[in-house]
């Protein structure tokens, strides 16, 4: 059986390397050689290349090396396929080196910002050692943020050899570190370089981006003065590596000025002591650069009413979130604050809030917040200045079992019956929403029974029980995840009821 | 094999010039960019100059800017470089090295001997 | 200019030891980490590039990692010849700068 005619030949020039061609198929059931013919110097020179299946690895492929190799140049390629039964000849293909040139790739030695030139890189390179030094390149430059994964491509060309080999790379974000990698190929070529190795460049510092700014309105004091713990944090959107030196507030009653009072701080909150009207509060950050536009926050009168318009909430857990949902009644509103921060029995110790805008919900990482702990949850409607009543919910990310069971105690024993009361368990152990307490009993040597009562119930009286018994009895607080039990406690029944005993001692 | 020779250090006068030479064998001396590199004694390695493959462009730190000038004759494999108002704390052993390229490896795989340049009245 | 800062500045070791050094950049410089060796009256060598290559002809007892800021050099087993400085250097960005250095010597 003769070979099969090789077919889609693929050649490709690695400059000042070697010339290689390869082609299908790739193995043969027969012994078969290969030669290669090639046609060169415009067609004055010929010359072969010669491979074998004995030859280690692809032998589907040959390679042609200097001196005979010389660039501008257009080969004729026709690969012919012999075995014990005879030759098969390809189809003759024809080959310009310019067009098949594959060179390494360049080496970027700079990325840099330019003095007083914003949101902008200058990146320099070195052109390949390996490259034709007449020939016109053209580039791929890829780039990123530093936590993206994804690249942005920018493709041009680069003529002169003698001048500096550098692209500004314009409309980044500022004070940004990004990630460049760079690409090359002779500008009539198919063949790209491989991508060069990495560099990391930061964008120029700016004048701070923005504030959110939000507030905490705590009761009134006794001598009138409502504190107002005031927060902010850089505003969505700004550049990672920003940082303020500090922050400047100001203050004043609604329609006087003349009362303005200022703070500089360094931190991010910071605790207002207001009157009962309505106040104005202004926050900038600063850096050496300058300062943050002004975030603006109004903080009502004492007796102001505030207006209502979520309806309903709901909180609801994906695989790796909590989306938080709300209706609302007024649909000028498309702007919210939400907060949360742990249920706990002491002072929250962090307290977390974001703005939503243009949606009715609000998603959260699982990972973010902590399993086993209970996060209160409030969204607050904000119609331009005014901010409306919250509407609040609860949600564990992950439930467990109580860490603890409820203590219990036995009251009110008669000959019957007991009343059993049990302690709610602290926030702290609860580990998940208790949906209900379930009450174990058992006489001495006898059957067990239990009872389920509702989570809110902390008290249950036990009927049919017999007289003059011992009874071990323990209450199980249960979650989703499960429940556990409370300490056992122990009691007896009474022979003869204190009502018969007393009435008695009267005759 | 490549091969980095330098030369034309010595004892010289703050303020006086003194001119170095790097004689580049055993590869294609203008494909590579060229750079030198300073040692003062007892002391860590400082960047002195860079210049591109054809010349076109040089690069120095703040240190060295307006005093040094890197140059370069590539029919001659040789890299120069021209040191005027010299200062003590200029002293130090001068390397001439190949790099940065895009070859792989570091940026300066290859050194030369050092040639010692004593900046002393 | 990126800030290479090399700990320690000198070691007492002693043959067959593992040794480790560690560089740490004033800024991100990616992996673009190179590690040379100095001996006494020469010129450097470069081991390592980027930040985990080994050069060629470089015995596999050397070894580099890290990425970002924070890199490390380890010789597994210390032997008598690798008595040396050894730097770091940043190839990130134009000026390339170097650490301080790191002196090997003999308990």
């Known amino acids: 059986v003769l070979p099969a005619k090789p077919e889609n030949i693929s050649c490709i020039f690695y400059y000042e390397e070697n010339f290689t061609c390869t082609w299908s198929p790739e193995k043969e059931a027969s012994y078969t050689w290969y030669k290669v013919k090639r046609t060169y110097s415009y067609g004055y020179k010929s010359d072969i290349c010669s491979t074998d299946n004995s030859t280690r690895g692809n032998h589907a492929s040959c390679s042609f090396l200097p001196p005979t190799i010389t660039n501008p140049d257009n080969y004729t390629i026709q690969v012919e396929a012999q075995n014990a039964d005879g030759i098969m000849k390809s189809d003759i293909t024809y080959w310009n080196l310019d067009a098949i040139m594959k060179i390494e790739p360049p080496e970027i030695f700079s990325v840099k910002s330019v003095l007083g030139i914003k949101r902008m890189l200058q990146i320099k390179w070195i052109r390949p050692v390996l490259a034709p030094h007449s020939s016109t390149l053209k580039y791929t430059l890829r780039f990123r943020t530093i936590n993206s994964a994804y690249w942005m491509e920018v493709n041009f060309t680069k003529e002169d050899i003698d001048r500096d080999e550098t692209y500004n790379l314009t409309e980044l974000q500022a004070f940004t570190e990004y990630v460049m990698t760079l690409r090359c190929a002779p500008a009539e070529s198919m063949f790209w370089s491989g991508w060069s190795q990495e560099k990391v460049g930061t964008t120029e510092e700016e004048a701070p981006y923005g504030l959110d700014l939000w507030r905490v309105l705590k009761p009134a004091m006794v001598d009138g003065r409502r504190p107002v713990q005031l927060m902010w944090k850089k505003a969505t959107g700004a550049p990672v590596l920003e940082k303020a030196l500090g922050y400047n507030i100001w203050y004043f009653p609604e329609n006087n000025t003349n009362l303005t009072e200022t703070v500089n701080t360094t931190n991010q909150t910071h605790e207002l002591y207001l009157g009962g009207k309505t106040y104005w509060v202004y926050v900038v950050s600063y850096n050496s650069l300058g300062e943050s536009p002004v975030a603006t926050l109004r903080i009502p009168a004492l007796n102001e009413k505030t207006f209502q318009c979520i309806e309903a909430m709901q909180a609801c857990l994906t695989q790796d979130q909590l989306v938080v949902e709300w209706q609302s009644s007024a649909p000028e509103v498309d702007t919210w604050m939400v907060e949360w921060f742990p249920d706990v029995d002491s002072e929250p110790s962090s307290f977390s809030w974001e703005s939503v805008s243009q949606a009715r919900n609000w998603t959260i990482q699982k990972d973010e917040l902590k399993p086993l702990w209970c996060y209160n949850i409030s969204v607050y409607p904000v119609l331009r200045d005014r901010v409306g009543q919250p509407y609040s919910t609860q949600a564990y990310v992950q439930e467990g079992i109580p860490s603890a069971g409820p203590v219990t105690q036995a009251d009110s024993i008669g000959v019957k019956t007991v009343t059993i009361t049990w302690k709610e368990i602290p926030k702290s152990k609860r580990n998940g929403f208790i949906k209900n307490y379930t009450i174990f009993y058992q006489a001495e040597d006898g059957k067990e029974f239990s009872k389920t009562v509702n989570s809110n119930i902390l008290q249950y009286r036990l009927e049919s029980l017999t007289r003059r018994t011992s009874y071990s009895l323990q209450v199980m607080a249960s979650t989703n995840a499960g429940g556990t039990n409370g300490t056992k406690i122990n009691f007896k029944t009474l022979s003869i009821s204190h009502h018969h005993h007393h009435h008695h001692h009267h005759h | 094999e490549v091969q980095l020779v330098e030369s034309g250090g010595g004892l010289v006068q703050p303020g006086r010039s003194l001119k170095l030479s790097c004689v580049a064998s055993?590869?294609?001396?203008?494909?590579?960019?060229m750079t030198w590199i300073r040692q003062a004694p007892g002391k860590g390695l400082e960047w002195v100059a860079s210049?591109?493959?054809?010349?076109?462009?040089?690069y120095y730190p703040d240190s060295v800017k307006g005093r040094f000038t890197i140059s370069r004759d590539n029919a001659k494999s040789t890299l120069y470089l021209q040191m005027n108002s010299l200062r003590s704390e200029d002293t130090a052993t001068y390397y001439c090295?190949?790099?940065?390229?895009?070859?792989?490896?570091?940026?300066?795989?290859?050194w030369g001997q050092g040639t010692l340049v004593t900046v002393s009245s | 200019d990126i800030v290479m800062t090399q700990s320690p500045t000198s070691m007492s070791i002693s043959v067959g030891d593992r040794v480790t050094m560690n560089c740490k950049a004033s800024q991100n410089v990616g992996s673009n980490v190179d590690w040379y060796q100095q001996k006494t009256g020469q010129s450097p060598k470069l081991l390592i590039y980027r930040p985990s290559n080994r050069y060629t002809g470089v015995p596999d007892r050397f070894t580099g990692s890290g990425s970002g800021t924070d890199f490390t050099f380890t010789i597994s087993n210390m032997q008598a010849e690798d008595l040396a400085v050894y730097y770091c250097?940043?190839?990130?960005?134009?000026?390339?700068?170097f650490g301080g250095g790191t002196k090997l010597e003999l308990k």
């Open positions: 210049i591109t493959n054809t010349g076109g462009s040089t």
């Open positions: 090295t190949r790099g940065p390229t895009t070859v792989v490896g570091g940026w300066f795989a290859y």
């Open positions: 055993g590869f294609t001396f203008n494909n590579y960019w």
């Open positions: 250097m940043q190839s990130n960005s134009y000026p390339p700068t």
